[in-house]
């Protein structure tokens, strides 16, 4: 399956649009940081099947248009930015979708593939669990929207190389 | 590899404007903030301040407020730092250095050559 | 702002020698303690981030412990090239502060 370049223009187009949505400076929220332990590992690329990394990569936006789904994330965020961000999102799902359909017939897909799909929801658990402990402050939902931009360059990366495999 | 590369020593007279650079390779230019540290002759490390290059947000230390200017241009990837009016006692060697902004990542973990500034009449 | 103190200064040591430095913060900084390395007419070197996380490619003798207000920089085998000045540096809250430095020379 060849993911389409609308695909990676989606990831940038994303990208742009959750750089767009801070509120607030994040020069205030230094003290805020935390360490949410991203799986970096899982976007390595170079240890996963096809199959296995567009699983990861599908997991990984589900997670993400989860957590921008919730009525704490409307609250937080200008409205019309948040639903440009989430259709983004709607539509990379709908193309890994197709992808890990067309993938999966063609491999078999092991058991090291659900450890990599759990170590990504347990990183979306830490993220939550944090924003929950934070009483969703402004500048918890700063820090978590810079983490996801974080982990979505790490998709990217995911992406670009998954192409250069084909 | 990540780079960041600075302008070279200027010689100026008090009373003179000088922007000096910082150019970032290697790397988002944009995930990252760029902080501007000075070291007087034969002293410690001051940070002066600190620019977001995706919006170009700052911050400055109370002490360099409304002394210099922080600047960046991400079409090209460099920062800048400004003054409008020099003073010798702004002879100092300044260095710029990336910071990972929010996230759980190293501070100031790549640093500029440093750019030498001697102030005299 | 936030102050730190280093101590001691300045320090004079031998080759093989463990060595200690402290850095305090004048109110609570909880982890947010990094420090640097500076060798002269060199630009500073990041060798712990964090408190105690070890930044990539420096030596595992370097070692770096504590949280709140006091912190340690220990380096458990001075080596030739480690003679250097070091300093501590809060990243809890801006402005971002440095230590005044401690030198490190050959006694």
């Known amino acids: 399956c060849d993911l389409p370049q609308t695909h990676s223009l989606g990831n940038r187009r994303a990208l742009i649009l959750l750089g767009q949505m801070g509120r607030i400076s994040p020069f205030s929220c230094l003290k805020d940081r935390h360490d949410f332990r991203i799986p970096q590992e899982e976007f390595d690329g170079n240890q996963f099947q096809k199959a296995q990394a567009i699983s990861v990569l599908h997991e990984m936006i589900q997670q993400t248009f989860n957590l921008f789904s919730t009525e704490d994330s409307s609250a937080a965020w200008e409205q019309s930015l948040l639903e440009k961000f989430s259709t983004e999102l709607y539509q990379q799902l709908n193309d890994l979708e197709a992808c890990v359909i067309q993938e999966v017939g063609v491999e078999e897909t092991p058991l090291m593939n659900e450890d990599s799909i759990l170590a990504v929801r347990k990183y979306f658990q830490r993220i939550t669990l944090y924003l929950i402990e934070r009483k969703y402050s402004p500048c918890a939902w700063e820090v978590v929207r810079a983490e996801i931009m974080r982990s979505l360059s790490f998709s990217t990366n995911l992406q670009k190389r998954l192409r250069r495999k084909d | 590899e990540v780079q960041l590369v600075q302008s070279g020593a200027e010689v100026k007279k008090p009373g003179e404007s000088l922007k000096i650079s910082c150019k970032g390779s290697?790397?988002?230019?944009?995930?990252?903030?760029i902080g501007w540290v000075r070291q007087m002759p034969g002293k410690g490390l001051e940070w002066m301040g600190i620019?977001?290059?995706?919006?170009?947000?700052?911050a400055y230390s109370p002490s360099f407020q409304g002394q210099v200017t922080i600047s960046a241009d991400k079409s090209i990837s460099t920062a800048y730092l400004q003054w409008s009016s020099l003073k010798a006692s702004d002879t100092a060697m300044y260095y710029c250095?990336?910071?990972?902004?929010?996230?759980?990542?190293?501070?100031?973990?790549?640093w500029g050559q440093g750019t030498l500034v001697t102030v005299s009449s | 702002d936030i102050q730190m103190t280093q101590s001691p200064s300045s320090l004079s040591a031998s080759v093989g020698d463990r060595v200690t430095i402290t850095c305090r913060a004048s109110?609570?900084?909880?982890?947010?303690l990094n420090w640097y390395q500076q060798k002269p007419g060199k630009a500073p070197k990041l060798l712990i981030y964090?408190?105690?996380s070890l930044q990539s490619g420096v030596p595992s003798r370097f070692s770096g412990s504590g949280s709140g207000t006091d912190f340690t920089l220990t380096i458990s085998s001075l080596q030739p090239e480690d003679f250097a000045t070091y300093y501590c540096?809060?990243?809890?809250?801006?402005?971002?502060?440095f230590g005044q430095g401690t030198k490190v020379e050959i006694k």
């Open positions: 250095a990336r910071h990972p902004g929010l996230n759980w990542a190293p501070d100031f973990d790549y």
């Open positions: 290697g790397y988002s230019f944009t995930s990252y903030w």
């Open positions: 620019i977001d290059p995706s919006d170009s947000d700052t």
């Open positions: 109110q609570s900084i909880d982890g947010s």
């Open positions: 964090f408190a105690s």
């Open positions: 540096q809060q990243s809890y809250d801006f402005p971002l502060t």
